[in-house]
Amino acid sequence: HTAAQDNCTCPTNKMTVCSPDGPGGRCQCRALGSGMAVDCSTLTSKCLLLKARMSAPKNARTLVRPSEHALVDNDGLYDPDCDPEGRFKARQCNQTSVCWCVNSVGVRRTDKGDLSLRCDELVRTHHILIDLRHRPTAGAFNHSDLDAELRRLFRERYRLHPKFVAAVHYEQPTIQIELRQNTSQKAAGDVDIGDAAYYFERDIKGESLFQGRGGLDLRVRGEPLQVERTLIYYLDEIPPKFSMKRLTA
């Protein structure tokens, strides 16, 4: 978990502090908030990024209808507990001893309870649907060009293996990107779809997590793709457990 950049910075995570006291005097970068060393050759986990953020001085229609079990992150920012590998702990609690269970992307998947609440396992989010609305353009984007550009973005900028970008749907002005990654599919070293989606979300909001890079400049055949709204749905391998009160609200 060290970075060996000449100028001792972390290209994939600006929420770090780097110093030349790693093994052999090499550059080592640590996430703010947790103090954990991070691997600057890949994306940092969403849990460590959220922790750093909280510590630093939100007809056959081609569009997908999110499942009834899809979760949206309505709770906003919180200071999460991360496990030794930087993943979200299954149970999260706030300072007032209110606790809840989260999935692998840190989104609440149960009602809130007290300290007696049990979260037996971290449930994996295996399907993420990123729903974007782009600003008006002279005409619609060519679907295959748009598809190719978004796949390239996830492959090159976020280092996500192309096989995890399941589909790109387009019905002007709505774009949907489907990311799928089962536990069995994710090999050691593979970027997690939850981390890639979080980096993308921050890029779209103009809050890039990359060090020193310009913001995201998305273009399709030279035409700027400017996003005006983003909604992300998370589907877990095991459906969430909310009370009927919430479901009917």
Partner: antibody, heavy 116, light 111 residues
Framework: QVQLVQSGAEVKKPGASVKVSCKAS????????IGWVRQAPGQGLEWIGD????????NYNEKFKGRATLTADTSASTAYMELSSLRSEDTAVYYC?????????WGQGTLVTVSS | DIVLTQSPDSLAVSLGERATINCRAS??????????MHWYQQKPGQPPKLLIK???NLESGVPDRFSGSGSGTDFTLTISSLQAEDVAVYYC?????????FGGGTKLEIK
């Protein structure tokens, strides 16, 4: 050569505050974390927290949060550790060290005695 | 917090003999690349002195009779041939996550 020189011994009353300084020389002060560790008489080492002078970033051991304050004056290449609401159990030698963990250079230590 | 348990608490070894000190972490402090465990020597009235960094990297100026090994949760500091000047208390420390805790120390004496 790298050196960390700490301020002299202090005697304080319970409830008071103490501020220990650590002057660094021989390296670029803003490039390395400065950690603070204490050692009660006859006891082991206890990590208080650390500060990155280059950006003022700090980490604290939860046990000391709210009582310990780490600061740094980059113009003077000096780090400070202030501990408030002192009690007798805070009697210890306080050390500064260069590095996040695996501190390679240490100050000589500052004895802080808390006694009424 | 990660708890580091050192064993034994104290150790008496004859001059020229091998001394072995263990440190067990309550959770893994290693990645596939590095182990975030360090070893210090402290003599009475002196600050700790770094001996081994990242489990096995000998600090410059430290005699090569000192060596470190281990990964995951179990780490060892070995002195291959004990010298009189090695009498001291030895501490392990991790730097995996905040807080960077220390082990309780092992007092090494001459038998």
């Amino acid at each position: 050569q790298v050196q960390l020189v700490q301020s002299g011994a202090e005697v304080k009353k319970p409830g008071a505050s103490v501020k220990v300084s650590c002057k660094a020389s021989g390296y670029t002060f803003t490039n390395y974390w400065i950690g603070w560790v204490r050692q009660a008489p006859g006891q082991g080492l206890e990590w208080i927290g650390d500060i990155y002078p280059g950006g003022g970033y700090t980490n604290y051991n939860e046990k000391f949060k709210g009582r310990a304050t780490l600061t740094a004056d980059t113009s003077a290449s000096t780090a400070y550790m202030e501990l408030s609401s002192l009690r007798s159990e805070d009697t210890a030698v306080y050390y500064c060290a260069r590095g996040t963990g695996g501190g390679d250079y240490w100050g000589q230590g500052t004895l802080v005695t808390v006694s009424s | 917090d990660i708890v580091l348990t050192q064993s034994p608490d104290s150790l008496a070894v004859s001059l020229g003999e091998r001394a072995t000190i263990n440190c067990r972490a309550s959770q893994s402090v290693s990645t596939s690349s590095y182990s975030y465990m360090h070893w210090y020597q402290q003599k009475p009235g002196q600050p700790p002195k770094l001996l081994i960094k990242y489990a096995s990297n000998l600090e410059s100026g430290v005699p090569d009779r000192f060596s470190g090994s281990g990964s995951g949760t179990d780490f060892t500091l070995t002195i291959s041939s004990l010298q009189a000047e090695d009498v001291a208390v030895y501490y392990c420390q991790h730097s995996w996550e905040i807080p960077y805790t220390f082990g309780g120390g092992t007092k090494l004496e001459i038998k």
